[in-house]
Interface confidence: low
């Protein structure tokens, strides 16, 4: 099974040693999250201090099973959840269509070799879209009025501004843009190494080593269960390292 | 209380077909996937193949052309028919409950239904 | 198809000794074995998932361990009880297969 065999290195994780130690590691996730409702949210959770092997992660909601990144066998969304759940990234999971029922607990278990299990809380709140959301498509062309009229203003000033100003000057704004930007983009949740063979990669066929030499239905009913889809969004859990 | 109950026909001719049924409480079959396993005398396990709880299928390559197995989850049953079948099917045959959640490991066996095939 | 190879065929031992089964898979599977004991004229019964993970309702001397290729079931004091066939079974990939089995017998 070529497309599974690859260790977690992106959770931190190599191959453990078979003698039982103390529970060691520790689950990070993100938290009490809030999203509105018809949004999506990604859950996310990272387990870090441990070198134990992770054999397969669940996704559950309060006691109903989510979806499934399982070092063998890949990817499993939940039949009831199969059109509102999307795999990754990572080992994480994407909630689409959010409606309020979807507030609640949420668990990442990770089955890890040898420590056993550790589990992970998050807590979603699904808001209703406000008033004034719904009320703002009706003010959509009164505001791109406005921030047009703000954009000449505001370009016109710079340009005036600009003029006035030395080379050097711009060169400092230049400067303090771009950290700006490098600030912003380290906001966003990420694991803690990195993501390229991450445990769960990226791959844009279904995996042949479910199947084998068996072709025919059976081969792609296989392939609909796992939920492994062709498309380069969703990937394979990939745990173990590949020895032939 | 978890339980899954065959009931077969227990004598088979050669060459004519098996049908049994997996009767199943406790548990719905909209959740868990059932497998069908079989013995034969003095020797080991043999997994045959799986329903999942979608209804989908995946076989043992070495049975494919002649197993089926079907469900009717209202009912809590699943069904397995094997054709032609010959003195070497001779079996105990168990349904078992299997699951992604257990990644495979058979939870629940039933107690197995006796098949022999003889004329 | 995995092939699981399990040995010894048959294991003597004395109540109260410690045992251990082997298991070994023709290819990786990582810790995708599960371990079964199947009393005379019984069903079999799951002991140990995921190689080492233990089972709710099965006594704690039933351990399981090893990864990769490589699988033991032990039970560290045996009782008259466990007298009984071992079996593993691999889930890492399709169809599903279990080994031959190992005997346990009193001596």
């Known amino acids: 099974m070529r497309w599974c065999l690859l260790l977690i290195w992106a959770q931190g994780l190599r191959q453990a040693p078979l003698a039982s130690g103390m529970m060691t590691g520790t689950i990070e996730t993100t938290g009490n999250i809030s999203a509105e409702k018809g949004g999506s949210i990604i859950l996310q959770c990272h387990l870090s201090s441990t070198t134990a092997q992770v054999t397969q992660v669940n996704w559950e909601q309060q006691d109903q099973l989510l979806a499934i990144c399982n070092a063998d066998l890949g990817w499993h969304i939940s039949p009831s959840f199969k059109d509102r759940v999307a795999p990754g990234p990572g080992l994480g999971l994407t909630l689409q269509s959010l409606t309020v029922n979807d507030t609640g607990e949420y668990f990442c278990i990770y089955h890890t070799y040898p420590d056993g299990t550790y589990t992970g809380r998050i807590f979603l709140e699904v808001l209703e879209s406000s008033v004034a959301e719904h009320g703002a498509r009706f003010q959509i062309p009164l505001l791109g009025a406005m921030a047009a009229t703000l954009v000449v203003i505001c370009t016109a000033v710079i340009v005036v501004v600009a003029l006035t100003r030395k080379k050097k000057a711009l060169r400092i704004h230049s400067v303090e843009g771009d950290l700006r930007r490098k600030s912003a983009g380290q906001e966003e949740w990420s694991p803690s190494a990195p993501s390229p063979p991450g445990s769960c990669v990226q791959a844009e066929a279904a995996p042949a080593g479910l199947c084998g030499e068996q072709r025919g239905e059976d081969c792609a009913e296989l392939h609909d269960y796992f939920n492994v889809l062709s498309y380069r969004s969703l990937g394979n859990c990939s745990f173990f390292t590949e020895t032939g | 209380q978890v339980q899954l109950k065959e009931s077969g026909p227990g004598l088979v001719a050669p060459s004519q077909s098996l049908s049994i049924t997996c009767t199943v409480s406790?548990?719905?079959?909209?959740?868990?996937?059932i497998s069908w396993i079989r013995q034969p005398p003095g020797k080991g396990l043999e997994w045959l193949g799986v329903?999942?709880?979608?209804?989908?299928?995946n076989y043992n390559s070495a049975f494919m052309s002649r197993l089926s197995i079907s469900k009717d989850n209202s009912k809590s049953q699943v069904f397995l028919k094997m054709n032609s079948l010959q003195t070497d099917d001779t079996a105990i045959y168990y349904c078992?409950?299997?699951?992604?959640?257990?990644?495979?490991?058979?939870?629940?066996w039933g107690q197995g239904t006796s098949v022999t095939v003889s004329s | 198809d995995i092939l699981l190879t399990q040995s010894p065929a048959i294991l003597s031992v004395s109540p109260g000794e410690r045992v251990s089964f082997s298991c070994r898979a023709s290819?990786?599977?990582?810790?995708?074995i599960h371990w079964y004991q199947q009393r005379t004229n019984g069903s079999p019964r799951l002991l140990i998932k995921?190689?080492?993970e233990s089972i709710s309702g099965i006594p704690s001397r039933f351990s399981g361990s090893g990864s990769g290729t490589d699988f033991t079931l032990s039970i560290n004091s045996v009782e008259s009880e466990d007298i009984a066939d071992y079996y593993c079974?691999?889930?890492?990939?399709?169809?599903?297969?279990f080994g031959a089995g190992t005997k346990l017998e009193l001596k």
């Open positions: 995921y190689a080492f």
């Open positions: 079974q691999q889930s890492n990939s399709w169809p599903l297969t």
């Open positions: 406790g548990f719905s079959l909209t959740s868990y996937d």
């Open positions: 329903i999942w709880t979608g209804g989908g299928t």
């Open positions: 078992v409950r299997s699951t992604m959640i257990t990644h495979y490991a058979m939870d629940y």
């Open positions: 290819q990786n599977i990582g810790t995708s």
